[in-house]
């Protein structure tokens, strides 16, 4: 399987909410001995391999934000801790999973990574990640709503998120 990032860049004004999205592609084994660990974290660009460094999102680690379930099942993070930090990660049965960040500030800008680990009991695990950038703008140059830019593999025309 692979992870796709529908959008590589999100440009948002301060105070707005944004949902960053990744999508699980390809055949997904739904056997009872396979589970999926999905999570989010921040990283830096100044490295050889994107997403190799794991930084917290609003002081929550990738362990705090993880989803753990089988196949294409739906799941949500533990509401309490994440929501106190204005965050919520979710996954649906179509392979989409996301993190929603509320009331953005400039401090939320940077590179975000989604990680999926396929865990086969008694076997090795397979891990893949996707990366996207969030730019939070202040002042008169800021858009009125979040604007999202498709990844290069898709149509390059930008789309305004509702």
């Amino acid at each position: 399987f692979k992870v796709a990032t529908p959008y590589s860049l999100y440009v948002c004004p301060e105070g707005q909410n944004v949902t960053l999205t990744c999508r699980l592609l390809g055949p997904v084994d739904k056997g009872h001995d396979v589970t999926f660990y999905k999570t989010w974290y921040r990283s830096s660009r100044g490295e050889v391999q994107t997403c190799s460094e794991r930084r917290p999102i609003r002081n929550l680690t990738f362990q705090d934000l993880h989803l753990h379930h089988g196949g294409h099942q739906a799941a949500n993070t533990s509401h309490d801790l994440a929501q106190r930090h204005g965050l919520e990660s979710a996954s649906d049965h179509h392979g989409n999973f996301s993190i929603t960040m509320r009331n953005l500030t400039l401090l939320d800008s940077g590179l975000y990574c989604c990680l999926v680990v396929e865990i086969r009991h008694h076997h090795s695990e397979h891990r893949v990640h996707g990366a996207m950038e969030l730019q939070v703008q202040t002042g008169k140059d800021a858009p009125s709503n979040c604007v999202v830019y498709p990844s290069s593999s898709q149509d390059s025309e930008n789309i305004t998120a509702a």
Epitope: L9, R45, T105, L107, E133
Partner: antibody, heavy 121, light 111 residues
């Protein structure tokens, strides 16, 4: 190690525009970080003017937003400060500085030596 | 804007003694548990130099006699023991909200 160096006119006439250049060596301004302009008035007060991020996005001090622009020339690894409608109140030492971008902490870890700009007729 | 008020404006300390500089913000500089407060040292004719970030993290290469503490709106920089080389201006700076702002500075002198 990364180095930053400011250049530009030392004297500007009132109502004219100021253009300063910051040349960065030993680090690509498109790789990471935010690239800032900060000024220090006579008497030592420091004021952050704005930054251009590694991907070209800008954020400015709201008090200057109507007359400031920060741009860059990626192949020359330079970024620029443009400040129009200069008055004597803009007399200061102007610094360019690098700051972390998109991490838990945002701070100025590398500074240029500064260039003094006097606004006078 | 977040206003940072430094005190005292100037400070004279004997060599080997402790210097304490305070910085108070007009509002909190914390963001979900991260403290966005820095301290810089500036010597005459030089640019400011980062000493402390995140209120208490000492920048690489900065002597251990420099330490920072505080949370919310109240912060302090401690220098102990003070050395001749520490004669300089010291500034606090917040990056919690745009515009990022600096304190007015504290001038450290030797008695």
């Amino acid at each position: 190690a990364v180095q930053l160096q400011e250049s530009g006119p030392g004297l500007v006439r009132p109502s004219q525009s100021l253009s300063l250049t910051c040349t960065v060596t030993d680090y690509s301004i498109t790789s990471d970080y935010a690239w800032n302009w900060i000024r220090q008035f006579p008497g030592s007060k420091l004021e952050w003017l704005g930054f251009i991020g590694y991907s070209g996005n800008t954020n400015y001090n709201p008090s200057l937003e109507s007359r400031i622009s920060i741009t860059r020339h990626t192949s020359k690894n330079q970024f620029f400060l443009h400040l129009n409608s200069m008055t004597t109140e803009d007399t200061a030492t102007y610094y360019c500085a690098r700051s972390l971008y998109g991490g838990s902490h945002w701070y100025f870890d590398v500074w240029g030596a500064g260039t003094t700009v006097t606004v006078s007729s | 804007d977040i206003v940072l008020t430094q005190s005292p404006a100037s400070l004279a300390v004997s060599l080997g003694q402790r210097a304490t500089i305070s910085c108070r913000g007009s509002e909190s500089v914390e963001y979900y548990g991260t403290i966005l407060m820095q301290w810089y040292q500036q010597k005459p004719g030089q640019p400011p130099k980062l000493l402390i970030y995140g209120a208490s993290n000492v920048e690489s290469g900065v002597p251990a006699r420099f330490s920072g503490s505080g949370s919310g709106t109240d912060f302090s920089l401690n220098i102990h023991p003070v050395e001749e080389d520490d004669i300089a201006m010291y500034f606090c700076q917040q990056s919690r909200k745009v515009p990022w702002t600096f304190g007015g500075g504290t001038k450290l002198e030797i008695k």
